[in-house]
Interface confidence: medium
């Protein structure tokens, strides 16, 4: 707590300007009016206040707005935002995308801090859903943002927002997250033609069920191995050798290099060896000829 001391004669601040940077902590406290600071917040960014001076300025705003800052002040916080705690931010009501952008800009180039995470959470909750413009903004600043959300949080993403998602935004998503996003993407891109549809849906295919992979195999999509390796194992297992060959097209040769890795390894174990041999890749580990193949999933369903 900064002690209350009288402002020395002639030092009362008439505006927020560079002359204040040589004010000592107690002088700032005594000579800068909180209301003046609030109305001239946009100037703070253009003045290189020190670490301790920023504490004083924050303290003045906290006293002026004990229930939380108004958006007119929040939008112009600039680097003073970095002094805010998650507890401070929870008191805010941020509704403008411009305010969000201005504060994310301050943290640009750094990992998502607890302050930023709290700000985003407040903003999204205030909006009720992750609309396209918000998602666009968040993924521009934090490509991994989408994958940091829980499947429950992702369920509030409307299909229309999926258009804002870039392939790199999904790099760190796990299968549970893709399970939620894939149906939304399928819906969002449903009116596109075959090749365009595949380009858009490709990044989301880690959440695709078997029947959709079978349908894709009929469309000459030539899926690359990197995409194939990210597919759900349970969705790949029921595919026949012919379907995988059609799905991968010229990329089918890449299966040899991946034969020890999932889902390729598990898929090989489910195929007849003579079917695998038709690929001419030397894939080994299939079911030997003459063995009876029991479809255990069918058996479980019957029992």
């Amino acid at each position: 707590e900064v002690e209350k001391t009288a402002c020395p004669s002639g030092k009362k601040a008439r505006e927020i300007d560079e002359s204040l940077i040589f004010y000592k902590k107690w002088e700032l406290e005594a000579c800068v009016d909180a209301a003046l600071l609030a109305t001239q917040m946009d100037r703070v960014n253009a003045i290189p206040f020190t670490y301790e001076q920023l504490d004083v300025l924050k303290h003045k705003l906290d006293e002026l707005y004990p229930q939380g800052y108004p958006e007119s002040v929040i939008q112009h916080l600039g680097y003073l935002f970095l002094k805010m705690s998650p507890e401070d931010i929870r008191k805010w009501n941020v509704t403008s995308l411009e305010t969000l952008k201005a504060l994310l800009e301050v943290n640009k180039g750094h990992e998502m801090s607890p302050q930023v995470a709290t700000l985003i959470d407040r903003f999204v909750k205030g909006r009720g859903q992750l609309d396209k413009d918000t998602l666009d903004t968040l993924t521009a600043f934090y490509p991994g943002y989408l994958c940091s959300l829980s499947p429950e949080e992702l369920s509030s993403v409307p299909p229309s927002s999926i258009w804002a998602v870039r392939p790199q935004d999904l790099d760190t998503c796990d299968p549970r997250q893709l399970d939620v996003l894939y149906p939304k993407a399928r819906l969002a891109f449903q009116n596109m033609n075959g090749s365009e549809y595949f380009v858009k849906i490709q990044s989301f295919l880690g959440g695709a069920p078997t029947e959709d992979l079978k349908a894709l195999s009929q469309q000459n999509v030539s899926m690359d191995l990197a995409t194939f390796m990210k597919l759900r194992t349970d969705a790949v297992l029921p595919l026949t050798v012919a379907e995988v060959q059609k799905l991968l097209g010229p990329h089918v040769e890449g299966l040899k290099a991946e034969e020890r890795h999932r889902p390729v390894r598990d898929w090989i174990l489910r195929q007849r060896q003579d079917d695998l041999d038709t690929l001419g890749l030397g894939l080994q580990g299939g079911i030997p000829n003459g063995y009876l193949v029991l479809d255990l999933s069918m058996q479980e369903a019957l029992s």
Epitope: F22, A46, T50
Partner: antibody, heavy 120, light 107 residues
Framework: QVQLVQSGAEVRKPGESLKISCKGS????????IAWVRQMPGQGLEWMGI????????IYSPSFQGQVTISADTSISTTFLQWRSLKASDSAIYYC?????WGAGWFDPWGQGTLVTVSS | AIQMTQSPSSLSASVGNRVTITCRAS??????VAWYQQKPGKPPKLLIS???SLESGVPSRFSGSGSGTDFSLTISSLQPEDFATYFC?????????FGGGTKVEIK
């Protein structure tokens, strides 16, 4: 990447004027504070002052106030440090450096330095 | 102005040694301290900000600690490329000031 490139070494006589430069690239030049730091031969580092190129309003360390002038030209992304009348004691390496953080913080990156020699 | 007193002004050490450099501020400055490394003929290079926050790309053998008035930079296992001069800097209040430097030499 963020880079600061300084003008070359200078040799001057006492009483002469001099203007050295620091060109920024790889970031928004207008929106970052640039500082000038002096290092006298075999000595430590001294902060001289800073400028916010967006409004070209320099702030000087009390020790350097009135001794030098800091300016900027945003059209060529360049900051300048100048002397009207050099003294032998101005001989030093001068570095420009970007404030790596908001406000008054630490410096990163630094220019390669400009060696100024003042000798009769 | 806040004075930053660095010690020692020089030290000799061998590769693999643990080295600690200290910096004392003339008044409390929270954790508003940065550390730099400077090699002959080169500009300083930022190692640590906020007293202990390691910059990206800086080897983990470097670490910083302290708050208030006493700060230290530690190199856990000195490598040949670490022989240089190290400076501390306070950014708590104006004018920004640096320590006098510590030269780390090969024993």
């Amino acid at each position: 990447q963020v880079q600061l490139v300084q003008s070359g070494a200078e040799v001057r006589k006492p009483g002469e004027s001099l203007k050295i430069s620091c060109k920024g690239s790889g970031y928004s030049f207008r929106d970052s504070w640039i500082a000038w730091v002096r290092q006298m031969p075999g000595q430590g580092l001294e902060w001289m002052g800073i400028i916010f190129p967006g409004d070209s309003n320099p702030i000087y360390s009390p020790s350097f106030q009135g001794q030098v002038t800091i300016s900027a030209d945003t059209s060529i992304s360049t900051t300048f440090l100048q002397w009207r009348s050099l003294k032998a004691s101005d001989s030093a390496i001068y570095y420009c450096a970007r404030h790596a953080a908001w406000g008054a913080g630490w410096f990163d990156p630094w220019g390669q330095g400009t060696l100024v020699t003042v000798s009769s | 102005a806040i004075q930053m007193t660095q010690s020692p002004s020089s030290l000799s050490a061998s590769v693999g040694n643990r080295v600690t450099i200290t910096c004392r501020a003339s008044q409390g400055i929270s954790s508003a301290v940065a550390w730099y490394q400077q090699k002959p003929g080169k500009p300083p290079k930022l190692l640590i900000s906020y007293a202990s926050s390691l910059e990206s790309g800086v080897p983990s053998r470097f670490s910083g600690s302290g708050s208030g008035t006493d700060f230290s930079l530690t190199i856990s296992s000195l490598q040949p490329e670490d022989f240089a001069t190290y400076f501390c800097q306070q950014f708590n209040s104006y004018p920004l000031t640096f320590g006098g430097g510590t030269k780390v030499e090969i024993k």
